[in-house]
Interface confidence: low
C-alpha cells in the first residue's frame, strides 16, 4: 500500500539503484516515485553532513523485501516511494529554494525582476529543467537579477551549492503550466533524426509517448512497430532530443511512428502509467512472482498491488491453467519496460497501474505545493482541492468554498446551506482558478446528497460542517485533486505554515473576487481566541487563525473553504472557514471548524453512504 511517513535522522543502508542531487527530501521522494526500481530513498540535507560532495545527496533504493535496515544519521531524511499513492503521484514541484544554487548546463541567461518571472521563463522554455536567480542583493553587482536557465543529463542538478542571495527552482512544465503548448499528432511512417537519449521496448507508440513525456530529456520519439523490417529493432522506442528542441529532419519510413513529448501541454498531461492490456502479447522480464488468478484484469490488479511489479503476462496456455484460473507472471526490469515483446502468443500483457493518478479512493494528498482580505492571487494547480459552490436560481453566483476530499466528496460549512438546502440549485466547480472562466459550457458537478452535521443549528457557530456527495465521481488531475484529512483528534502537531484560500470579499463591504486568493495566516491558541470573543464560546472543536494587527483574513464568500497547513511536506485540511467578527479586524481572528475533531463523523458518513470508506487520514 501507500506509505507516506518520513523518517527523520535515519538513512537506509544498502539497496542503491541511483543517486543524484536534489534540493530537499520531497523532490528526492518524487524522483524515487518515478524511478522504475526505487521503493525507498534517503536524503542528506546540507546541514547533515560535512562532506561537500554528499551534501544534498538523494539516494534511490530498492529492496527485494520492500524494506532496508535504517541506520541513525543526524539530519538525514528517509522515506518511501509514492508508487501506489494515487493522486499524490505528481512530477510537479513548485518550491523555490532560497540561498541555494542548483548547478547544471547554463544555456540561457537574461535579466528579470523576480524569481517567479525566472521560473516562468524556465517553464516556457522547451529545454529548461531548472533555474537559478541572483537577487537584487547578490554580492556581484553585474550578476544581480540574472535568470539562468539550466538542464542536465538526468534532469536533476549536477551539484547544489549553498550560496547567499541566490534562489533556485524547477520548471513547472510537469505541473501542466507551460505556455509552449504541445503537439498531440502521431506521425505514421515517419522517423525523426537527432540524438537518442534512451531506448526502451514498448508495445505501441502511445506507451512510447508517455515514457517520453516523463523522461527528463526526451522531446520527441520514434517507435518501430512489430512489423519493422529489422527484427532486433521491432517495438523499439527511441527517446530523442535536439539542440533546437525540435527534430532537425524526418525521413519517410514504413512501419515507424513518431511524435512529441506531451510535457509542454497546458492544463492536462497524460497519466504516468499505461492502463491498456495487450491480447496475444507476452512481455519478457525478470520473474518476480507467478500466481494463479481468474482473468487478465485480476492479473493486472495483482501486479499493481505488488509494488515491485512493473508489468505482467497472463498466460492462457492449457498447461498454465487450472479450472478457471491461469498463471499470472509478474515481472520487472531495470528500466520498467519489457526486455522482450513477443506477438501471436496465448497470453495477454500489460503494465502495473502503480503510477496511475486516479489510484485508490482511500488515499490522501501530499502534493501541490469568505474572499481573502490581504491576500494575493493564487496560481493554477496551487490549491487543487478548492471548489466553488455556486447557486443557480435566476442568475448564478458563487456562495461558498469547499474542499475536495475524495472522488465523490466535498467538505464544506453547514451554514452555506442555511435557507438553501435544495440539492438541484447547487453547481460545484472544481479545477478552476478564475470565476470569470466559467461559462454555460464549463462542466460542473451536481449534488447527490447534502449531509449537514446533526448537531448544527442555524445561526449558531457550533458543528459548522457539511459533506456533499457528488452525483458522479471526479477524475483527479494536477488542477483537481483531494486534500488530505488530519488524523482523528490531531492535537500534537504544531502547524506553522497555514493558508486560507477563497474567492470571497477583499474587504468587509466588498465583492466576490475573480481570481482565487490565498493568504498565509498563523494559528491562534483557543485560549487567546476566547479572550477576543468573550460573547461566544470557542470550543475544542474550533480552531482560530489570524494576525493580532488584523489585515489578513477570510471573509464573506470564503465560508466552507479550506484552512490548510503544510507539515512534513504534506498539506492537511486543518479547518473549514466558518465565522468571525467582521473581516481582518484587529485582534479578531477568524474561526474555523476543526476537522480533526470530526474525523469519526466524516468517516461514518462517507462509509455508510455506500458501504466503503472514500478517504483516509495519513498513515
Amino acid at each position: 500500500g501507500c506509505l507516506t511517513q518520513l523518517y527523520e535522522n535515519a538513512f537506509f543502508r544498502g539497496g542503491d539503484v541511483a543517486s543524484m542531487y536534489t534540493p530537499n527530501a520531497q523532490y528526492c521522494q518524487m524522483r524515487c516515485t518515478f524511478h522504475p526500481r526505487c521503493l525507498l530513498f534517503s536524503f542528506l540535507p546540507a546541514s547533515s553532513i560535512n562532506d561537500m560532495e554528499k551534501r544534498f545527496g538523494c539516494f534511490l533504493k530498492d529492496s527485494v523485501t520492500g524494506t532496508l535496515p535504517k541506520v541513525h544519521r543526524t539530519g538525514a531524511v528517509s522515506g518511501h516511494s509514492l508508487k501506489q499513492c494515487g493522486h499524490q503521484i505528481s512530477a510537479c514541484h513548485r518550491d523555490i529554494y532560497k540561498g541555494v544554487d542548483m548547478r547544471g548546463v547554463n544555456f540561457n541567461v537574461s535579466k528579470v525582476s523576480s524569481v517567479e518571472e525566472c521560473q516562468k521563463r524556465c517553464t516556457s522554455n522547451i529545454r529548461c529543467q531548472f533555474f537559478s536567480y541572483a537577487t537584487q542583493t547578490f554580492h556581484k553587482a553585474e550578476y544581480r537579477n540574472n535568470c539562468l536557465l539550466k538542464y542536465s543529463p538526468g534532469g536533476t542538478p549536477t551539484a547544489i551549492k549553498v550560496l547567499s542571495n541566490v534562489e533556485s527552482g524547477f520548471s513547472l512544465k510537469p505541473c501542466a503550466l507551460s505556455e509552449i503548448g504541445c503537439h498531440m499528432n502521431i506521425f505514421q511512417h515517419l522517423a525523426f533524426s537527432d540524438v537518442d537519449v534512451a531506448r526502451v521496448l514498448t508495445p505501441d507508440a502511445f506507451v512510447c509517448r508517455t515514457i517520453c513525456t516523463y523522461h527528463p530529456n526526451c522531446l520527441f520519439f520514434t517507435f518501430y512497430t512489430n512489423v519493422w523490417k529489422i527484427e532486433s529493432q521491432r517495438n523499439v522506442c527511441l527517446l530523442k532530443t535536439s539542440e533546437s528542441g525540435t527534430p532537425s529532419s524526418s525521413t519517410p519510413q514504413e512501419n515507424t511512428i513518431s511524435g512529441y513529448s506531451l510535457l509542454t501541454c497546458k492544463r492536462t498531461l497524460p497519466e504516468p502509467c499505461h492502463s491498456k492490456i495487450y491480447p496475444g502479447v507476452d512481455f519478457g522480464g525478470e520473474e518476480l512472482n507467478v500466481t494463479f488468478v481468474k482473468g487478465v484484469n485480476v492479473c493486472q490488479e495483482t501486479c499493481t498491488k505488488m509494488i515491485r511489479c512493473q508489468f505482467f503476462t497472463y498466460s492462457l496456455l492449457p498447461e498454465d491453467c487450472k479450472e478457471e484460473k491461469c498463471k499470472c507472471f509478474l515481472r520487472l526490469s531495470m528500466d520498467g519496460s519489457p526486455t522482450r515483446i513477443a506477438y501471436g502468443t496465448q497470453g495477454s500483457s500489460g503494465y502495473s497501474l502503480r503510477l496511475c493518478n486516479t489510484g485508490d479512493n482511500s488515499v490522501c494528498t501530499t502534493k501541490t505545493s469568505t474572499r481573502i482580505v490581504g491576500g494575493t492571487n493564487s496560481s493554477w494547480g496551487e490549491w487543487p482541492w478548492q471548489v466553488s459552490l455556486q447557486v443557480k436560481l435566476t442568475a448564478q453566483r458563487h456562495l461558498c468554498g469547499g474542499s475536495l476530499i475524495g472522488h465523490q466528496w466535498v467538505l464544506t460549512a453547514a451554514h452555506c446551506f442555511d435557507g438553501l438546502p435544495l440539492q438541484d440549485v447547487w453547481r460545484i466547480y472544481s479545477g478552476i482558478l478564475n470565476l470569470s472562466d466559467i461559462t454555460k459550457d464549463t462542466p460542473f458537478s451536481q449534488i447527490k446528497e447534502i449531509i449537514i452535521h446533526q448537531n448544527y443549528k442555524v445561526s449558531e457557530g457550533n458543528h459548522d460542517i457539511a459533506l456533499i456527495k457528488l452525483q458522479a465521481p471526479l477524475n483527479y488531475t494536477e488542477f483537481q485533486k483531494p486534500i488530505c484529512l488530519p488524523s482523528k483528534g490531531d492535537t500534537s502537531t504544531i502547524y506553522t505554515n497555514c493558508w486560507v484560500t477563497g474567492w470571497g470579499f477583499s474587504k468587509e463591504k466588498g465583492e466576490i473576487q475573480n481570481i482565487l486568493q490565498k493568504v498565509n495566516i498563523p494559528l491562534v491558541t483557543n485560549e487567546e481566541c476566547q479572550k477576543r470573543y468573550q460573547d461566544y464560546k470557542i470550543t475544542q472543536r474550533m480552531v482560530c487563525a489570524g494576525y493580532k494587527e488584523g489585515g489578513k483574513d477570510a471573509c464573506k464568500g470564503d465560508s466552507g473553504g479550506p484552512l490548510v497547513c503544510k507539515h512534513n511536506g504534506m498539506w492537511r485540511l486543518v479547518g473549514i472557514t466558518s465565522w468571525g467578527e467582521g473581516c481582518a479586524r484587529r485582534e479578531q481572528p477568524g474561526v474555523y471548524t476543526k476537522v480533526a475533531e470530526y474525523m469519526d463523523w466524516i468517516l461514518e458518513k462517507t462509509q455508510s453512504s455506500d458501504g466503503k470508506a472514500q478517504m483516509q487520514s495519513p498513515a
Epitope: R13, G14, G15, D16, V17, S19, R37, M334
Partner: antibody, heavy 119, light 107 residues
Framework: EVQLLESGGGLVQPGGSLRLSCAAS????????MGWVRQAPGKGLEWVSG????????MYADSVKGRFTISRDNSKNTLYLQMNSLRAEDTAVYYC????????????WGQGTLVTVSS | DIQMTQSPSTLSASVGDRVTITCRAS??????LNWYQQKPGKAPKLLIY???SLQSGVPSRFSGSGSGTDFTLTISSLQPEDFATYSC?????????FGQGTKVEIK
C-alpha cells in the same frame, strides 16, 4: 548483449601510476552503479571501488582509499580507475563490473586486465 | 568491515552429488548476499542474488537460502561444468566484502 572491456593494465614499478579503463556497451550505462573488483594471483576476490550512476558519489575499500580514484564518463560509456602510489600488494587481475539494480550484486563482469607492480 | 567466512575451503565431489557450501557473515546482513561461480582464467559469474533469487539463465539445480548471518548455496545434482570456485559476497554495506572462496573439485 552486455559487454565490459577493460584496458590499461601492465607492469609498473612500486610508487608508480596506472589508469584502467572499462568500455561498456549493450546497456544504458548512465543508469547503473559500476565498480572494480580485483583478484590477486591464487587469491579470492576483493571489492575495490564503486561509483553511482551520476558519478557524484564514490566508494572505496580501505586498502586503496586515498590512492585510487574511480570516475566515469557517461557520454563515452566508460569507467575509469586511476591508481597512484602503487604497491606490490596491488598486483592482481582487475575486473570491471556492473551492479544489478536493487541488490548491489555485480551481474556482469569484464574479462579482467592484469596489473603487475614490481621493481 | 563485515567479514565473510566460507566453508569448506575445498570440497571433493562426484558428478550427481548434492553439494552444499556455507557462508557466514560477521554481522546481520538480512538477505543481502550473492553467490558467484568462477572458473580458472575467467571472470566470476553471478548465480544467486539476494540470498535466494536465481539469476536469469542460471540452471535451477543451483539454489540459495539463509538470512541474517548464515547462508547456504546448494547444487542439487553436480554436473561436470560445475567444478569451479564459488564465492559469496555481502552487499549490505560498503565495502562489499567477499568470502575467501570454496573450490569444488572432482573426487
Amino acid at each position: 548483449e552486455v559487454q565490459l572491456l577493460e584496458s590499461g593494465g601492465g607492469l609498473v614499478q612500486p610508487g608508480g601510476s596506472l589508469r584502467l579503463s572499462c568500455a561498456a556497451s549493450g546497456f544504458t550505462f548512465s543508469l547503473y552503479i559500476m565498480g572494480w573488483v580485483r583478484q590477486a594471483p591464487g587469491k579470492g576476490l576483493e571489492w575495490v571501488s564503486g561509483i553511482y550512476p551520476s558519478g557524484g558519489f564514490t566508494m572505496y575499500a580501505d586498502s586503496v582509499k586515498g590512492r585510487f580514484t574511480i570516475s566515469r564518463d557517461n557520454s563515452k560509456n566508460t569507467l575509469y580507475l586511476q591508481m597512484n602510489s602503487l604497491r606490490a600488494e596491488d598486483t592482481a587481475v582487475y575486473y570491471c563490473a556492473r551492479e544489478s539494480s536493487g541488490v548491489a550484486a555485480p551481474d556482469y563482469w569484464g574479462q579482467g586486465t592484469l596489473v603487475t607492480v614490481s621493481s | 568491515d563485515i567479514q565473510m567466512t566460507q566453508s569448506p575451503s575445498t570440497l571433493s565431489a562426484s558428478v550427481g552429488d548434492r553439494v552444499t557450501i556455507t557462508c557466514r557473515a560477521s554481522q546481520n546482513i538480512s538477505s543481502y548476499l550473492n553467490w558467484y561461480q568462477q572458473k580458472p582464467g575467467k571472470a566470476p559469474k553471478l548465480l544467486i542474488y539476494a540470498a535466494s533469487s536465481l539469476q536469469s539463465g542460471v540452471p535451477s539445480r543451483f539454489s540459495g537460502s539463509g538470512s541474517g548471518t548464515d547462508f547456504t548455496l546448494t547444487i542439487s545434482s553436480l554436473q561436470p561444468e560445475d567444478f569451479a570456485t564459488y564465492s559469496c559476497q555481502q552487499s549490505y554495506s560498503t565495502p562489499r566484502t567477499f568470502g575467501q572462496g570454496t573450490k569444488v573439485e572432482i573426487k
